[in-house]
Amino acid sequence: AGVFELQIHSFGPGPGPGAPRSPCSARLPCRLFFRVCLKPGLSEEAAESPCALGAALSARGPVYTEQPGAPAPDLPLPDGLLQVPFRDAWPGTFSFIIETWREELGDQIGGPAWSLLARVAGRRRLAAGGPWARDIQRAGAWELRFSYRARCEPPAVGTACTRLCRPRSAPSRCGPGLRPCAPLEDECEAPLVCRAGCSPEHGFCEQPGECRCLEGWTGPLCTVPVSTSSCLSPRGPSSATTGCLVPGPGPCDGNPCANGGSCSETPRSFECTCPRGFYGLRCEVSGVTCADGPCFNGGLCVGGADPDSAYICHCPPGFQGSNCEKRVDRCSLQPCRNGGLCLDLGHALRCRCRAGFAGPRCEHDLDDCAGRACANGGTCVEGGGAHRCSCALGFGGRDCRERADPCAARPCAHGGRCYAHFSGLVCACAPGYMGARCEFPVHPDGASALPAAPPGLRPGDPQRYL
């Protein structure tokens, strides 16, 4: 994990003739903000969803009013960095899009209007942990100067943020074969040797010797799909590539897309498909016209001469979406049902199912308890698409197959001693207490706060807890 950081140094007219008109005027004061979109890999042809590595919006810059007759200077910029956190490894090669947006602050009905001033894009190689890289990009008559870097979040280190660092166990040096973690010389690189046999695809470890499973996988070596029902295709052995994944709540829960945008999950986050006339990571930007160049990937913009009339993007072959922002790829046919996430593995597609669904296409609604046996007299409790067993006394685990130690939770109060029994537990109460769990004090006059003990049992005798 780590953060990609972008520092905008200046945005203003580029060198050469044809200086651009100032984007702001006395009648229409405005301020700038920036959006960065990151995709892994160098190839613009990659069938990655937009901003698969992440995206960020800057704060709004200071309000700027053009001085009459003066050429457009470098425009005042927002404070601070644009930060795009990444959860997985830093890919080393990435594509970026940086957009400069203008927010007009005149007397617009319905609040400020946004329009796209410039968009620059590029492809770069960058190692995490390295120094700031400087760049200059031109978009028409505008010039954008910026720096960027990728840095790892502790305990991750390395050029891809995949190595972990741990505090030294000994003050003098790191263990055998382990290097100090530059620049944290007081820490050592952790040897990430997972448990032998831990699935390299579905398991990982943060401590040596462990095997933690990715969402949807289970078992000591993370080789068992959480649901294997109907996971095999009619085509025989190759079908083993389709694990059925059943993760928990997704990034689209609660629909982060504004203005009627529809949300779809991407491998790392979410993506909004905006209705016409809206734009931005969460469809939060409106008032876009053809003059703003809203059509990506060579799309042709038609109509939309003013913010009140919607534009239409006619997309070139291979692209779709209201802004031609989506590549038509093999997931575009939506093979995954019930909100499942489609992943193109190259040799096959895989569906990552939402909670409560399973099957290669997430087509099976998991009737929580159907076909689920709870062992040893346990009863199945339905809930949220994931069955749960309520186990009989003395048993535990997901399917009540594990013998539980009924005394492990120290159920006997007031110093009572617990004894495991074939039908549960027995509490031997300390003098002065009674009850199945020794929870009731015995009154000094011999009467208790409860009805009298059953015949044959004196207060203080062990009582069976059923």
């Epitope: 069938a47 295709s233 085509r235 190759s238 079908s239 590539t241 389709t242 072959p317 291979g318 038509v328 790829d329 093999r330 575009s332 046919l333 939506q334 093979p335 049902r337 190259g346 040799h347 096959a348 597609l349 895989r350 569906c351 290669p360 296409r361 087509e363």
Partner: antibody
Framework: EVQLVQSGSELKKPGASVKVSCKAS????????MNWVRQAPGQGLEWMGI????????IYNHKFKGRFVLSVDKSSNTAYLQISSLKAEDTAVYYC?????????????WGQGTTVTVSS | DIQMTQSPSSLSASVGDRVTITCHAS??????MGWLQQKPGKAPKGLIY???NLEDGVPSRFSGSGSGADYTLTISSLQPEDFADYYC?????????FGGGTKVEIK
């Protein structure tokens, strides 16, 4: 046994419309995409488009956008290709072919083909 | 669009011959391709999927190989029923595209 049975030959005048059907049996209709492929007389194969019968989502070859519409009727396990404003150059054999929606993506079973002749 | 260049466009061979047909994609397609056989007046029939896997019921004399952008269909010992047209098809990217076809004729 998997079968794709297409409707019979059609003779149409220019400007008319035609709807070719492809009835599927022997498998779960919604688990496989349906492709449509055109073969003009003496020519090779040309991919027209694809439909996901479960959702109705379609993707067309840009050459076949506009006058060509793919659709399905899930209740009868039937896929359709409709061509409007027919032209002489639409004269061809039209095939439907199923394709696994997740794994190997092969077009493994094909309909027998429907010949559409456009002539005045 | 991905172009699929198939060669040769036709070939003459005798029963028992080993026949090789090649297909070159204009960009890498990661094995997402297949081979089809079409006999006159009939619908195409799937032979090979995913570059090298035999469709059900296809005789083992047919085999596919290749990776990246270059793929080959081999018939190890040509039989009388194998005289037909053969097409490659890529399904790595929309629109799917077919090779121009290879006509295998009796010498």
């Amino acid at each position: 046994e998997v079968q794709l049975v297409q409707s019979g030959s059609e003779l149409k005048k220019p400007g008319a419309s035609v709807k070719v059907s492809c009835k599927a049996s022997g498998y779960t209709f919604t688990d496989y995409y349906m492709n449509w492929v055109r073969q003009a007389p003496g020519q090779g194969l040309e991919w027209m488009g694809i439909i996901n019968p479960y959702s109705g989502v379609t993707i067309y070859n840009h050459k076949f956008k506009g006058r060509f519409v793919l659709s399905v009727d899930k209740s009868s396990n039937t896929a359709y290709l409709q061509i409007s404003s027919l032209k002489a150059e639409d004269t061809a054999v039209y095939y439907c072919a199923r394709q696994d929606s997740l794994l190997d993506y092969a077009m493994d079973y094909w309909g027998q083909g429907t010949t559409v002749t456009v002539s005045s | 669009d991905i172009q699929m260049t198939q060669s040769p466009s036709s070939l003459s061979a005798s029963v028992g011959d080993r026949v090789t047909i090649t297909c070159h994609a204009s960009q890498g397609i990661s094995g997402n391709m297949g081979w089809l056989q079409q006999k006159p007046g009939k619908a195409p029939k799937g032979l090979i999927y995913h570059g090298a896997n035999l469709e059900d019921g296809v005789p083992s004399r047919f085999s596919g190989s290749g990776s990246g952008a270059d793929y080959t269909l081999t018939i190890s010992s040509l039989q009388p029923e194998d005289f037909a047209d053969y097409y490659c098809v890529q399904y790595a990217q929309f629109p799917y595209t077919f090779g121009g076809g290879t006509k295998v004729e009796i010498k």
